[in-house]
Structure formats: structure tokens, C-alpha cells
């Protein structure tokens, strides 16, 4: 998303005008942040605290189990992606506080926001991979019995990370530092300059591969899984439905503003009022998308079977039960079964 719509710490919200009147200074300074930026800062702060602590805990719990439990491999990769994304938040936070001034230099401008994107897309694509895994568990149990192993799970994760890297390359290549003459400020953003077609292509590819395709995968997989599990009286439950709806809805809700504004801006002239309005909302859209980075640990805890009873346990042991459990498969973006004793269990208890 283009980021060249920001004001400066020195001159605040500079309001330009088209008349030369020496008696009326054009410099209308204000060091107050815009409302969308304040909201973004609040969200960033909450996401950082919950995301770093929650994902660190998940990494700690799953790291020991990742060699033998496929569940743990999924959770570990998701948590690493989210954790790394959260670590970059203080930089975004600092930039917004300084009215989007970028004091970190050109190399940081290319690398840091690109790392954020890399990890965000890795999270999305891993969710799609997990949902595909669940689909296979339900509909191809014999294939899973024969081929579903830790090695394949790691390969699937590597593919997800690789695709995330590919999605991030355009952002990395076109990301530049621009120093504006007045008001004096340094901005970090994506600049396609002459190539509006390429900007649109990047936005469309990002929308399809980073949003629509995973969303479609999740929706289809969970719809089929629901239909199969609901057809068996023993596994029919409202909790399953709630978790599945939470998975798809949270993904859709939190990424939608970022993707919609991104695609709209790629088709608008940078000087148009709509573009400028959307660009003012950019930080808020990014922060909204960032909620995905802290929502996983929350879902892991809330969706744990017998949650009420487990509250008395310590958080690590609660997470261990949820994340490395092998006897029951749960319906969320975070719950996938790795091994079960019998194929009957595999198809009945998903």
C-alpha cells in the first residue's frame, strides 16, 4: 500500500492553499495525531502485548513437540510468523507517533515493512495449509494414514513461507525513502512512479493469493468438514460451528479493510480526494490486519475443550493440552489432529 500521505513532526498538518496572501500564513501547524492514527496506535499496543506474550508462549509449548506432533508443527509456524510480525510493531508505532516520519533509514525502510508483510502472508497461507490438512484428515483418512507425516508438514510450511516471500518481493523492490522538501520529513513507502499497471498487478495478485484464495480454501474446507461432522450425531455440536465461523470471520474481517483499500488505491490517482482519504486510513487498516497476529493464541485458549474446567490449570499446561493433543481433532484454524489410534476415530471426531 502506498504510504506517501503523511504529515511531519515539525510542521504537523500542513494545510496547503493556492493563493499567495502574505498576510495569512499558509503554515497551519498542529502536532495532534489524526483519529485513525490514534486508534491504530491503541490497536498496535494491544496486539504487541498480547501477540508477543501469547505467541512466545505458543512457540515455547510447541517447540518441544514439533518433532513428533504434526499439530505442533502448524502451531509453531503460525506462532513464529505472528511473533515476528509483532516484534516489528514498535517500529511502526514509533513512526506513527512521529506523524509517519521515518527516522530508520533506507535499508530499514526496504527490509522492516517487507518482513512484516512476509510474516503476515505466511500466517495467512499457513492457515490455508492447515485447513487443507484438516480436509484431508476427514475425506482422505487412508491417504493420511500412509503419507501424513512430520516431513510432509514441514515441506507444506516451507511452501507457505516461500509463497509468502514471493508475495513480499514487489513490496521490497518498490519500497523507497522519500524526503519531502516541505514540510520537511522523510517518508517510507512504496513508489511505483511511472508504472501504475505494475502497481495494480501487485495489488491484484496480493488480493487473490493473500486473501481471496486462502479465504476460499478456508470456507470450502470448513463447509465440507462441517457437513461431514454434522452428519454424524456423535460429533454434532454448536461449539464446532462457532469455532469454524470464528476462524473464517476473523480472517475475513481483519484483512478485508487492508485489501480493499489497497486495491482501490492502486486504481486511483494519488492526487485524488478518495486516494488521500484512503491513505489517511492506511495505518488503521494495517493495525486492523495486525489483530490476526494476536488472535490465534486467544482462539487456542478459548476454543480448548473443557475450557471452563481448565482455567484452574496454568496457561502453559492449558496450551500444551490444546496444541499437542492427539486424541481429539478440533475445528478451528488452530486445531488439527496429528495421529489417532484408529481410522474410525479419525473420521468420527474431527
Amino acid at each position: 500500500m502506498n504510504s506517501f500521505n503523511y504529515t511531519t513532526p515539525d510542521y504537523g498538518h500542513y494545510d496547503d492553499k493556492d493563493t499567495l496572501d502574505l498576510n495569512t500564513p499558509v503554515d497551519k501547524t498542529s502536532n495532534t495525531l489524526r483519529v485513525p492514527d490514534i486508534l491504530a496506535l491503541v490497536i498496535f499496543a494491544v496486539v504487541f502485548l498480547v501477540g508477543v506474550l501469547g505467541n512466545a508462549l505458543v512457540v515455547w509449548v510447541t517447540a518441544f513437540e514439533a518433532k513428533r506432533t504434526i499439530n505442533a508443527i502448524w502451531f509453531l509456524n503460525l506462532a513464529v510468523a505472528d511473533f515476528l510480525s509483532c516484534l516489528a510493531l514498535p517500529i511502526l508505532f514509533t513512526s506513527i507517533v512521529q506523524h509517519h516520519h521515518w527516522p530508520f533509514g533506507g535499508a530499514a525502510c526496504s527490509i522492516l515493512p517487507s518482513l512484516i508483510l512476509l510474516n503476515m502472508y505466511a500466517s495467512i497461507l499457513l492457515l490455508a495449509t492447515i485447513s487443507a490438512d484438516r480436509f484431508l484428515l476427514v475425506f482422505k483418512p487412508i491417504w493420511c494414514q500412509n503419507f501424513r507425516g512430520a516431513g510432509l508438514a514441514w515441506i507444506a510450511c516451507a511452501v507457505a513461507w516461500g509463497l509468502a516471500l514471493l508475495l513480499t518481493i514487489p513490496s521490497f523492490l518498490y519500497r523507497v525513502v522519500r524526503e519531502e522538501y516541505f514540510p520537511p520529513k522523510v517518508l517510507c513507502g512504496v513508489d511505483y512512479s511511472h508504472d501504475k499497471r505494475r502497481e495494480r498487478a501487485v495489488a491484484i495478485v496480493r488480493l487473490v493469493l493473500g486473501f481471496l484464495w486462502p479465504l476460499l480454501t478456508l470456507t470450502i474446507c470448513y463447509t465440507f468438514i462441517l457437513l461431514r461432522t454434522w452428519s454424524r450425531r456423535a460429533t454434532r455440536s454448536t461449539k464446532t460451528l462457532k469455532v469454524v465461523v470464528a476462524v473464517v470471520a476473523s480472517f475475513f474481517i481483519f484483512w478485508l479493510p487492508y485489501q480493499v483499500t489497497g486495491i482501490m488505491m492502486s486504481f486511483l490517482e494519488p492526487s485524488s480526494p478518495t486516494f488521500l482519504l484512503l491513505n489517511k486510513l492506511d495505518s488503521l487498516c494495517v493495525s486492523f490486519a495486525y489483530i490476526n497476529c494476536c488472535i490465534n493464541p486467544i482462539i487456542y485458549v478459548v476454543a480448548g475443550q473443557g475450557f471452563q474446567g481448565r482455567l484452574r490449570k496454568s496457561l502453559p499446561s492449558l496450551l500444551r493440552n490444546v496444541l499437542t493433543e492427539e486424541s481429539v481433532v478440533r475445528e478451528s484454524k488452530s486445531f488439527t489432529r496429528s495421529t489417532v489410534d484408529t481410522m474410525a476415530q479419525k473420521t468420527q471426531a474431527v
Partner: antibody, heavy 119, light 112 residues
């Protein structure tokens, strides 16, 4: 009426320093930026730097190590100092202002100071 | 730095005819506030440059309406609808969106 008047030496020896003064009238330096631009013989214009109303300065990175811009608000004067002059610093030096942070481009210009760097 | 490329280098024109000068920037000149800080100057022999057009199309006070500016993003044009003798000189385009502000190489308008 807005005016910018320049004063400074016409001939400077290589490796010496150049100092030019720009005295403004018709506006206050406390809320207006003043830029310095030079034009080598038969060539285009080159921006050297700016001093904003709040005293913040910005220089052309290619010349940053040799340039210094300062001002005296009470005297309505802006000063340009160029150190370690070389023969290719021979140019017409202008002070200019956009006024009122308007960024309309350089609306008002000084008459220029022709500086020749020669032994 | 933003490179400003002006064409043509020299423009012979008959008095009363239209003249058109093109200016292209190496980067987008759209400022983060939505404005485009592309300006046009005229420099007559032995004089300081004079601002004609600011922010792409706005005429500076006192500039005749035969001067007009247009363009967006990276491509800009200055048009003089009916060239008069007093219009002769070197025309420069310049940007003050990014640091450092940069100028085009100049276009010399001369009588054919």
C-alpha cells in the same frame, strides 16, 4: 513590497571561503524559508539549501560538507557560506523565497551574486 | 535526486504562434498532501529567474493568461498560446516536492 538583495565578493581564490548575505524586506524571516540556488555559466540551476522560518536547515547532499546557511531574524538577513571553493564553484548565486511555507516554488529572487573562483 | 528532463532544448517559434515545452520527472512528484509541486520559470538574459506557474497549473500573480500549465505524476507541459517578443528567454521546469529541489536543463525559446 517583497525584495531580496544580495551582497558579497565577486572574486574568490581557490580553497578560500565564500560568504554571501541576502537582506530581505516585505516579509519576516521568522515564518518564511529562504533558499539558495546557483547557476553555473551556460548551465541549469542547482539548489544549494534552505533555512526555514524556525531555523531548520537542509542542504544539497552533494555539497553538504562545504555549505552553511544561517540567519539573523532581527536584521532580516540570511547568510550563505561555502568553504574550500574550487573553480567549478564559479556561478551566479541567488537567494530565493517561496514565502509563508507555501511551497509555491521560488516566488521571489535576489538579483544574484556572480562569484568567480580564480587564482 | 529527481532528474527533470526538458524537451526540446531549443524552441524556434514565430510570434503569435503557440509554443509547447515538455518536462518529465524521474519520480512521481505527487506530495503526500496530494499536491504536485512542479513549477515553471522564465529567465531572461542577465536577469534572475521569474516564477510563471506554480503547482502544475496555477499562474503566479501578474503572469499573462496565455501561459498555461498541465500534467500529472511525472509528465508536465507548459503552453504559451500566442508567443510575444517579451516571452523570449530560457524556460525551466522545477520540482519542490522532494529534497533536493531540482531543475530541468532549460528550453530556449527563440524567434524563428
Amino acid at each position: 513590497q517583497v525584495q531580496l538583495k544580495q551582497s558579497g565578493p565577486g572574486l574568490v581564490a581557490p580553497s578560500q571561503s565564500l560568504s554571501i548575505t541576502c537582506t530581505v524586506s516585505g516579509f519576516s524571516l521568522t515564518n518564511c524559508g529562504v533558499d539558495w540556488v546557483r547557476q553555473s555559466p551556460g548551465k541549469s540551476l542547482e539548489w544549494l539549501g534552505v533555512i526555514w522560518g524556525d531555523g531548520l536547515t537542509k542542504y544539497n547532499s552533494a555539497l553538504k560538507s562545504r555549505l552553511s546557511i544561517s540567519k539573523d531574524n532581527s536584521k532580516s538577513q540570511v547568510f550563505l557560506k561555502v568553504n574550500r571553493l574550487q573553480t567549478d564553484d564559479t556561478a551566479m548565486y541567488y537567494c530565493a523565497s517561496a514565502l509563508d511555507y507555501s511551497n509555491f516554488g521560488f516566488a521571489y529572487w535576489g538579483q544574484g551574486t556572480l562569484v568567480t573562483v580564480s587564482a | 535526486d529527481v532528474v527533470m528532463t526538458q524537451t526540446p532544448l531549443s524552441l524556434p517559434v514565430s510570434l503569435g504562434n503557440q509554443a509547447s515545452i515538455s518536462c518529465r520527472s524521474s519520480q512521481s512528484l505527487v506530495h503526500s498532501n496530494g499536491n504536485t509541486y512542479l513549477h515553471w520559470y522564465l529567465q531572461k538574459p542577465g536577469q534572475s529567474p521569474r516564477l510563471l506557474i506554480y503547482k502544475v497549473f496555477n499562474r503566479f500573480p501578474g503572469v499573462p493568461d496565455r501561459f498555461s500549465g498541465s500534467g500529472s505524476g511525472t509528465d508536465f507541459t507548459l503552453k504559451i498560446s500566442r508567443v510575444e517578443a517579451e516571452d523570449l528567454g530560457v524556460y525551466f521546469c522545477a520540482q519542490s516536492t522532494l529534497v533536493p529541489p531540482t531543475f530541468g536543463g532549460g528550453t530556449k525559446l527563440e524567434i524563428k
